[in-house]
Each structure stands twice: as structure tokens, then as C-alpha cells.
């Protein structure tokens, strides 16, 4: 899948964890979208 960024921000962003996609694992199905 594809995700485009730069159009809006996530106002509910957690303050303790980065909102970037976590490192891939073999269990990952939709890491960035």
C-alpha cells in the first residue's frame, strides 16, 4: 500500500511513541498505511 504525507497532521499523536512506522517484522502487514 501507499501513504502520502504532508497534507494533514495527526492531532492525536502520542507524546511517548514516535508516529513513524515501526521497524518491519515478518508479522507486519501494513506498516505504513
Amino acid at each position: 500500500s501507499e501513504t502520502t504525507t504532508g497534507t494533514s497532521s495527526n492531532s492525536s499523536q502520542s507524546t511517548s511513541n514516535s508516529g513513524l512506522a515501526p521497524n518491519p517484522t515478518n508479522a507486519t502487514t501494513k506498516a505504513a498505511g
Partner: antibody, heavy 118, light 107 residues
Framework: QVQLVQSGAEVKKPGASVKVSCKAS????????MGWVRQAPGQGLEWMGE????????TFNQKFKSRVTMTRDTSISTAYMELSRLRSDDTAVYYC???????????WGQGTTVTVSS | DIQLTQSPSFLSASVGDRVTITCRAS??????GAWYQQKPGKAPKLLIY???TLHSGIPSRFRGSGSGTEFTLTISSLQPEDFATYYC?????????FGQGTKLEIK
């Protein structure tokens, strides 16, 4: 040790496409996203997007979404970035960079100079 | 998108000096600020991530601090090899954004 080795310099005409490769070694290629960053002459750093090597999911900077294609070949631990419909202002050094979740862009390729000129 | 503003844009200093570069974000990026060093013709090199964590192999004279909207990079005693351009970056959300850079020159 982690190494990212990019393909060589390219000279392209306006309207053409360019494909840059980035071969990874020294770590599990599938365990980290691969990002792409460019730098125009004398300018700052501009993030273009990234690819998940396992799922091939991509996240793009909106500015490049319509012109950039990111792919990977896990069998040879290589990521690719293709930029189409080149313009003169696409003249830049293009970098691949491994992104670790907690650490950000922790290892970078040496850069590939792309010159767009008629 | 988040905007990152670095100050100063240019900085002249001497070997042995202590220098500080500031990065301000247009909204909170929690602790997720990073700093990179770039020398002419070379790729950027990660120095600091998550606000204050030193990347492996980076000398301890480099120190990062801050959270929320303001981050600082301090070099405690400048060495000749430290004269370069420094960029801040946010790694809290997409799109990943860099500051405009601070060029550190020899006085």
C-alpha cells in the same frame, strides 16, 4: 559494518526518468525501512519517502508522490528509487538512508548525483 | 507539515570554543529530534537521536537536549573536524522534516 552503496552519477534530459539503486550490506535488509533524501546544490535536505522492504508499503512526501517509484529486491538487498518527468530543479544528490524506528536515519549511502540538463 | 527553524544559520567559532545550535519546531515533536553533521561532498552523519541520545561512535563532546518544540545541540570543545553544516530533523511523524541547516565556520 552497515554499508549502503549507491549507483553512479547520472546525466538526464528534461522529461526523462532516472533510477537510483542502493545496495545494503552488514545488516538484515528486511528489518529496517529504507528512506530516500535529496539535496539540491547548496541547499538543505529534503525527505522524499521510504519503503518497507518486507511488505513494499511506501510512505511518500506529497511533493514527490506523482513522480517517484520506490521498489526493492530482497534477494539482493537492494532498494531502488525512480524519479520520472525530470526537470532542471531535480538536479541534486540523492541519498538512500536506513531508518531505524527509535534512531531515525542512522546510516546513509554515499549519494548519487543526478544532473538534469538539456 | 511541521516546520523546523534552526538558529543561527551561520556560526563562526574557534577551536576549543563551546557552541550551541537551536532548533525550534512549529508544534511539539515530543522527544523525537535528531541532529546530523554534513561535510562538503559527503553524506550526512547521525549524531544525536531522540533528543539527547548519542549515536554509536560519536564523541561525547556532542550533546543534545530538549523536547517538545525546542532542541539544542551543544559542542563542548570544538575540534578542527567539527567545522561542517549541522541539520536538525524531526522523527516524530510523517513527513520527516529537516531544518534549514547551520554552517559552522572557523573564525
Amino acid at each position: 559494518q552497515v554499508q549502503l552503496v549507491q549507483s553512479g552519477a547520472e546525466v538526464k534530459k528534461p522529461g526523462a526518468s532516472v533510477k537510483v539503486s542502493c545496495k545494503a550490506s552488514g545488516y538484515d535488509f528486511t528489518g529496517y525501512h529504507m528512506g530516500w533524501v535529496r539535496q539540491a546544490p547548496g541547499q538543505g535536505l529534503e525527505w522524499m519517502g521510504e519503503i518497507n522492504p518486507i511488505t513494499s508499503d511506501k510512505t511518500f512526501n506529497q511533493k514527490f508522490k506523482s513522480r517517484v517509484t520506490m521498489t526493492r529486491d530482497t534477494s539482493i538487498s537492494t532498494a531502488y528509487m525512480e524519479l520520472s518527468r525530470l526537470r532542471s530543479d531535480d538536479t541534486a544528490v540523492y541519498y538512500c538512508a536506513r531508518r531505524d524506528y527509535g534512531t531515525s536515519l542512522d546510516y546513509w549511502g554515499q549519494g548519487t548525483t543526478v544532473t538534469v540538463s538539456s | 507539515d511541521i516546520q523546523l527553524t534552526q538558529s543561527p544559520s551561520f556560526l563562526s567559532a574557534s577551536v576549543g570554543d563551546r557552541v550551541t545550535i537551536t532548533c525550534r519546531a512549529s508544534k511539539s515533536i515530543s522527544k523525537y529530534g535528531a541532529w546530523y553533521q554534513q561535510k562538503p561532498g559527503k553524506a550526512p552523519k547521525l549524531l544525536i537521536y531522540a533528543g539527547s541520545t548519542l549515536h554509536s561512535g560519536i564523541p561525547s563532546r556532542f550533546r543534545g537536549s530538549g523536547s517538545g518544540t525546542e532542541f539544542t545541540l551543544t559542542i563542548s570543545s570544538l575540534q578542527p573536524e567539527d567545522f561542517a553544516t549541522y541539520y536538525c530533523q524531526q522523527h516524530n511523524e510523517y513527513p520527516i522534516i529537516f531544518g534549514q541547516g547551520t554552517k559552522l565556520e572557523i573564525k
